[in-house]
Every structure is written in structure tokens, then in C-alpha cells.
């Protein structure tokens, strides 16, 4: 299927110009290769009219021009003084030859219809009102005022001063005086509809005397705006249908064959097909709401209409906007998965993407929820805090320049299942939709932290692990200190060249983290996860509340009683003989216990087990404080 | 960041007027949609109105509807909140919000200004 998308009809009169929009996928090549605009002969065959490359044929000449917006991948084929000749079928395309990424654009011309000469025109949209105008003389101010509508032979009755009403008309039709000015009435018709275009008379007085006067009213449908979007991107309908209408149900409709089909409306009604991916936004002080679809499917594309109607549904009669939306599939949005699932207890990396060439845009993320017109709370983003109900388990990461921001979501319950929204303050065609399915767990954590009840004594070393599983031997590790604003990722150090191990006993990885020595501020969330470069993985999370200590425990002076609290992260392979209290069991904060840093030994455990005590508790300890000797000399 | 000041605050009688300003800089200003909200003394911070980024579309409170008027000017960063008919109940400090957002997803403000105070005697 051809990326290029334009106008399928285009409808002028003699004498009158046409501007024809065309659009090509943003991709380089297309921005600066040949456009052009030929007419389709009987063979088959394209005959150029005009090109970017500067040819203008003879029936072209001075009435007619290609420009290439860059900028907006668009170019426009403008041309003047339309003739009858010029109907016919036409291809506005991209390549070197007429045989390239082409669409096609039929241009029909018709004839100026001949009116009588003294006709006023009246041009409105179908739902609108009209007002005729209708002049007379002072002595026809106390005859009957009528307006007729002219059918073949004769002139039936819309309505007049004596309150008769053709019934198709009765109330949308109203006669009326202004004021004091008897040389003037008035007809008002409303909720127009393509029934009531055609040639009018409107007539003051009776016989030869009577005034008259000839109205032509053209009732047009709306011309579609065209809107072209890139798969998995996403579109906004802004619908903008006056005041008169602002207090009425709205909705949004895609035309299938000769119904249009409600997506959604302002009464609750939605389509199932755009569940999780569509919201109607609240109405403007004028009456004006706009419907957002995100995730946008190659079956999104099609026409559709915005409206406004007490029934929520589309009525004739009633103003309407419409779209012809085309869905690009050679789209710039990178493929990712639609669906993530994770497991009760569990946590879940998203990976967001944003247009990369906004990477200083303010990055969000938003659950959609159906109720009513459907809304997206945000959740978390750059500047926003996160929501209260997510405190501890939610934070946005933002990687500079990636194209990419990742969301981690942990502590899952199945609450958390449903749609959420990937959003920035930039470029609105990259807004994306994720499914998150919560199964429940079937078997124990990859990550768990010990001790899972956490409670830290002020002034004292507190140490907490995290234990993984081999899979994660490779990835980097790391404990971050969770706050509304985000994880902040502590510092780690890696000794020396990481180690590989030969054998992975599946019980024995973990990863420490020391608060030493502890202070009130390290109270809070702490997480713990894995990452590859900037590809994050699985976390999990731990509350650790700071206490005073009570009387008679035993604490470890710090050598700085204003260093802030000690933080070190060890990474050991643990002998499986030793338990994990008699692993912890003698807090050894070293020589440098006041350094504010995490210390990432990496797998250089597995030679110190192999040299050290590892039979006894005491053992490890030395061997894990003679690594930080080593490391700062 | 976004630095937002607001001025134009003061005291005014009941049925008086005032026009309230508010002056961004840092990043571009077109990128935000714009909102006033007041905070009376012991109650929450409400929303009066709001504005798109392109300033097409306006947002009020129903307390503030035909009274107030919001309105932008991106050329030069500011933001206006034209108040009519003040009535003693509109006493609050009134603050102005940057939002990344427009209104699609619910106006919550990603940077706020000082506030500046109004007070409407009877």
C-alpha cells in the first residue's frame, strides 16, 4: 500500500482555483526526492504537469505551482482559473519517475449554475441556520409575508405570516420582523440538511404588485480534514462545533458504508476496539472537545465525524466536523510490545518511547481509565510527583537522548492491571498505549531482600541484601533510594575486572547494601534492581524505618558523627554452608566506615572465598573489610 | 525548568477589577499549557482557569464563569487572568501553573509561581 495520502475528490467550479495537500513519510529521502502531480490518460499512462524539479507543462503555464513543505511532509499542487477540461484523474507522487509512491486524486469542475440574476446566495454547513434576508415596500407592510421553496413547476410553501408551516419545517422555520423597520422580514431556518438546498422565494403582497425575491441556498457537507499518522502513533479529532451546541451530548463516529458508527461519546458510550486507547477531553468554556486515540492500528484509518446531539448519536440536521484519517505503516514509531505482563508481588520495566529529537521534553506516564468520557490521570513524570497511592513502587527513569524512558511499576497487585499511556510535553503523535496483565505468582521472587522487616538503628550499620537468581549473574545490579521525584541510583564501585564464574549456585547471589552509619534521612524505600546499559529489569523494593536506639544495644561509633549515613553495596557469592546470619552476624564497617559511597566488590568474592575463612563468620567479614582496604590504597 | 512569577495582586472593593500577569522563562513557553489557581487561608488549592498552549481553547471554574477571563500572549511569555466583579469569597493568593500536558489529561500543574495575594473587601 502506497505511503502517500492525499484528497481522494476534489470539487471546484469554472473560474475557481483548487490547493491540494499531499503527504509522504518523514523520512529524508522523501523530504528532498522529486515530487509531482500528473493526469492519468486512457492507457494508463501519467502525464506530468508539474514537478519540485522545476517543469511546468503548457496547460499549466501561469495558472498553476508545486511547493514542498519539509518541514510538515506535505507538498501542494496549487492551481488557478479551473476549466471544465480540467476534470479528470490525477496522481500526486514521489520518485524519479511517474511510476513511483503515488495517490490518487479525482478533480471534478463543474459548470457556474445559472441563477437568475437578482439572487442573493446563501452557503452554509449542513446543521447550521440560515437567516434570508427578504426587502419590501412600505405599502406591502400589512400583506402576507411568505418564503416558498421551488420545486419543478411550482413554489411550495416553507412558511408565512400567518403561522402555516410546511410540516418538514415545523420548528426549525420562523418568520419575524426586527424592531421597528417595516421594509424587512425575516426567515430563520434550522439544523439545515442537504434536503433543504435549492432555490427559494421569498414574497411580500399578492398580484403584480407583490415584492419578490429569488434565494439560493447551498447546504455543504463539511470538507474532511485530512490527517496523516504513523502507525502505533496517535491522533487528536479537535472538534469544534459553536456555542450553540456547547450544552449537548458529543460524540465522535466512523463512517461505515452509509452509517457512521459511534467510537465514543460524552454519554459513556465506547466502542470496544479502542478500549484503553481513547478519551474525549473536558469541553472548553466555548463548547469545543477534542477525542484522543492513541496506539493508532492500520484498521484505524477511514473517515470519521465529530457531532453534538442530546442522544449522544449522529442526527441529520445537526452540525458535524469530519476527518479522513490515513495510517501510515511505514511508521517512525519503534515497535515495541503492546502488552507486558507481570506477576503479583512483581515488578515491571516499561520502556516509553519519545520522539528523540525532543529528549529535554517532560516525560509522563498515565492510566487510563474508561469511566465516563475516559480520562488519564498522570501517575508520575519528570516534574510531577508521583501519585500518592504509588508511593515506593513507581519512578520514571529518563535516559538523555535515548529516545527511551522506562517506567518501573513493582509491588504489583492485580489492581495494577490495565492500560497506561507513554506521554511527553513534545511531539503528541508519540503518545503510545501499554496493556499491563497481572497473573499471580506461581513461585517465589527472582529478587528478595533480607531482612524483609527492616527496621535500622539510628547512629548503628544496617545492612540489607538482596538476593538473585544466576540469570541475573551478568547484569549490572543496584540499589536506589526511592522519593516521589524518583529512584536516585546510589554510586557503586566495581574492584578490579569482574570474574567469571564457573559454577552458579542458584542460592547464593546477592547484593548488599550498608547504611553506615544510620541517620534519619536514610529512612524510606529502597529498591533494589537489575539493569543491562540502560535497559532496566526486575526490581523489588524494601521499607526500612529508622529507630532510636534503646538502651544497651550495642552501636559503632562513627569517626565523623556528621557524615551523612554510609552507604555499601557489596556484591558476594556466599558460601551456601554459611547462613545468612552468621553471614551478617558481626557488622564490620572497616577502616572507612564514614565514606559515603557504595562499594560494588563484584565477583572477586569467589577468589576471596577461596583464599579467606570462609568457614566462619568472622572470616568473611575480614575478607569483605580488607576488599575496602584494597580498594582505597 | 520553567520560572514563573506572578504580579499584579493586591486590594480591591467588591465589584472592583483586577489583571493579574504572570511571566515565564526558561524553556519554551508555546510547550505549556497555562492555569490560575487560588488558595484561601485554612482551605485547598483550587483551579480558577485555564488556557491551551496555543490559547484556543479556555477552561473556568463555574464559581469564576463570565467574571473571569484568561488569556496568553506566547510572544511574550506571559499569561493574564482578567478579574471582574470580585466578590469578598475571591480573597485567596493566586497562583500561576505551567502544565507539559494541555488539558487532555487533567491540569495539575508541572511548575507553580510564588503567588501573589488578592484581597476583596466589602
Known amino acids: 500500500k502506497s505511503p502517500i495520502f492525499g484528497p481522494q475528490e476534489v470539487s471546484s467550479i469554472e473560474g475557481d482555483s483548487v490547493s491540494i495537500t499531499c503527504y509522504y513519510p518523514d523520512t529524508s529521502v522523501n523530504r528532498h526526492t522529486r515530487k509531482y502531480w500528473c493526469r492519468q490518460g486512457a492507457s494508463g499512462m501519467c502525464t506530468t504537469l508539474i514537478s519540485s524539479n522545476g517543469y511546468l507543462s503548457k496547460e499549466y503555464s501561469g495558472r498553476a505551482n508545486l511547493i514542498n513543505f519539509p518541514e510538515n511532509n506535505t507538498f501542494v499542487i496549487n492551481i488557478e482559473q479551473l476549466t471544465q477540461d480540467d476534470t479528470g484523474s490525477y496522481k500526486c507522487g514521489l520518485g524519479t519517475s511517474n511510476r513511483g509512491l503515488s495517490f490518487d486524486v479525482s478533480l471534478e469542475v463543474s459548470q457556474v449554475p445559472e441563477l437568475p440574476s437578482d439572487t442573493h446566495v446563501y452557503t452554509k454547513d449542513i446543521g447550521r441556520n440560515v437567516t434570508i434576508e427578504c426587502p419590501f415596500k412600505r405599502e406591502n407592510a400589512p400583506s402576507k409575508k411568505s418564503l416558498c421553496k421551488k420545486t419543478n413547476q411550482s413554489c411550495e410553501l416553507v412558511i408565512d405570516s400567518t403561522e402555516k408551516v410546511n410540516p418538514s419545517y415545523i420548528g426549525r422555520a420562523k418568520l419575524f420582523m426586527k424592531g421597528t423597520d417595516l421594509t424587512v422580514f425575516y426567515v430563520n431556518i434550522s439544523h439545515l440538511t442537504h434536503n433543504d438546498a435549492g432555490l427559494y422565494i421569498c414574497q411580500a403582497g399578492e398580484g403584480p404588485s407583490a415584492d419578490k425575491k429569488n434565494v439560493d441556498l447551498q447546504v455543504l457537507a463539511p470538507e474532511p480534514e485530512l490527517l496523516y499518522k504513523d502507525l502505533r502513533s496517535s491522533v487528536t479529532f479537535e472538534c469544534d462545533l459553536g456555542r450553540e451546541v456547547a450544552n449537548e451530548a458529543k460524540y465522535l463516529c466512523r463512517m461505515n458504508k452509509e452509517t457512521c458508527d459511534v467510537i465514543i461519546n460524552t454519554l459513556g458510550k465506547r466502542d470496544p476496539d479502542f478500549e484503553g486507547r481513547i478519551l474525549i477531553t473536558p469541553k472548553d468554556d466555548n463548547g469545543r472537545f477534542s477525542v484522543l486515540i492513541t496506539g493508532l492500528r492500520k484498521e484505524d484509518a477511514g473517515h470519521y465525524q465529530c457531532g453534538a446531539h442530546s442522544s449522544g448519536l449522529p442526527q441529520e440536521g445537526w452540525p458535524i466536523q469530519t476527518w479522513q484519517l490515513f495510517v501510515n505503516e511505514e511508521s517512525t514509531i519503534p515497535n515495541r510490545r503492546s502488552v507486558v505482563k507481570g506477576v503479583t508481588g512483581g515488578s515491571v520495566a516499561i520502556a516509553c518511547p519519545y520522539n528523540p529529537k525532543e529528549s529535554s521534553s517532560l516525560k509522563y506516564w498515565c492510566r487510563w481509565e474508561g469511566d465516563g468520557n475516559g480520562h488519564c490521570p498522570v501517575l508520575v513524570g519528570t516534574q510531577a510527583q508521583v501519585q500518592e497511592e504509588y508511593e515506593g513502587r513507581l519512578a520514571l527513569f529518563d535516559q538523555p537522548g535515548n529516545g527511551t524512558y522506562t517506567v518501573i511499576l513493582n509491588q504489583l497487585t492485580t489492581e495494577d492491571a490495565g492500560f497506561y499511556w507513554c506521554l511527553t510535553n513534545g511531539d503528541s503523535r508519540w503518545r503510545t498505549t501499554i496493556e499491563l496483565q497481572v497473573a499471580e505468582a506461581t513461585r517465589e521472587p527472582n529478587l528478595e531482600v533480607t531482612p524483609q522487616n527492616a527496621t535500622a538503628v539510628l547512629g548503628e550499620t544496617f545492612t540489607v541484601s538482596c538476593h538473585y537468581p544466576c540469570k541475573f549473574y551478568s547484569q549490572e545490579k543496584y540499589w536506589c533510594k526511592w522519593s516521589n521525584k524518583g529512584c536516585h541510583i546510589l554510586p557503586s564501585h566495581d574492584e578490579g575486572a569482574r570474574q567469571s564464574s564457573v559454577s552458579c549456585d542458584q542460592s547464593s547471589q546477592l547484593v548488599s547494601m550498608t547504611l553506615n552509619p544510620v541517620s534519619k534521612e536514610d529512612e524510606g524505600w529502597y529498591w533494589c534492581g537489575v539493569k543491562q546499559g540502560q535497559t532496566y529489569g526486575e526490581t523489588t523494593a524494601i521499607y526500612i524505618a529508622v529507630e532510636e536506639r534503646t538502651r544497651g544495644s550495642s552501636h559503632v561509633n562513627p569517626t565523623d558523627a556528621n557524615a551523612r549515613a554510609k552507604v555499601a553495596l557489596e556484591e558476594e557469592v556466599v558460601d551456601s554452608s554459611i547462613s545468612e546470619k552468621e553471614n551478617k552476624a558481626i557488622p564490620n564497617p572497616g577502616p572507612f566506615a564514614n565514606e559515603r559511597e557504595i562499594q560494588n566488590v563484584g565477583d572477586q568474592a569467589q577468589e576471596n572465598r577461596a583464599s579467606g575463612d570462609a568457614g566462619s563468620a568472622d572470616g568473611q567479614s575480614r575478607s569483605s573489610s580488607s576488599k575496602h582496604h584494597h580498594h582505597h590504597h | 525548568e520553567v520560572q514563573l512569577v506572578e504580579s499584579g495582586g493586591g486590594s480591591v472593593q467588591a465589584g472592583g477589577s483586577l489583571r493579574l500577569s504572570c511571566a515565564a522563562s526558561?524553556?519554551?513557553?508555546?510547550?505549556?499549557?497555562m492555569g490560575w489557581f487560588r488558595q484561601a487561608p485554612g482551605k485547598e488549592r483550587e483551579f480558577v482557569a485555564g488556557?491551551?498552549?496555543?490559547?484556543?481553547?479556555?477552561y473556568s471554574a463555574d464559581s469564576v464563569k463570565g467574571r473571569f477571563t484568561i488569556s496568553r500572549d506566547n510572544a511574550k511569555n506571559t499569561v493574564y487572568l482578567q478579574m471582574n466583579s470580585l466578590k469578598p469569597e475571591d480573597t485567596a493568593v493566586y497562583y500561576c501553573?505551567?502544565?507539559?500536558?494541555?488539558?487532555?489529561?487533567?491540569?495539575?500543574?508541572?511548575?507553580w509561581g510564588q503567588g501573589t495575594q488578592v484581597t476583596v473587601s466589602s
Open positions: 501553573a505551567a502544565d507539559g500536558l494541555d488539558y487532555a489529561l487533567g491540569f495539575r500543574g508541572d511548575y
Open positions: 526558561g524553556r519554551t513557553f508555546s510547550n505549556y499549557a
Open positions: 488556557i491551551s498552549r496555543s490559547g484556543g481553547s479556555t
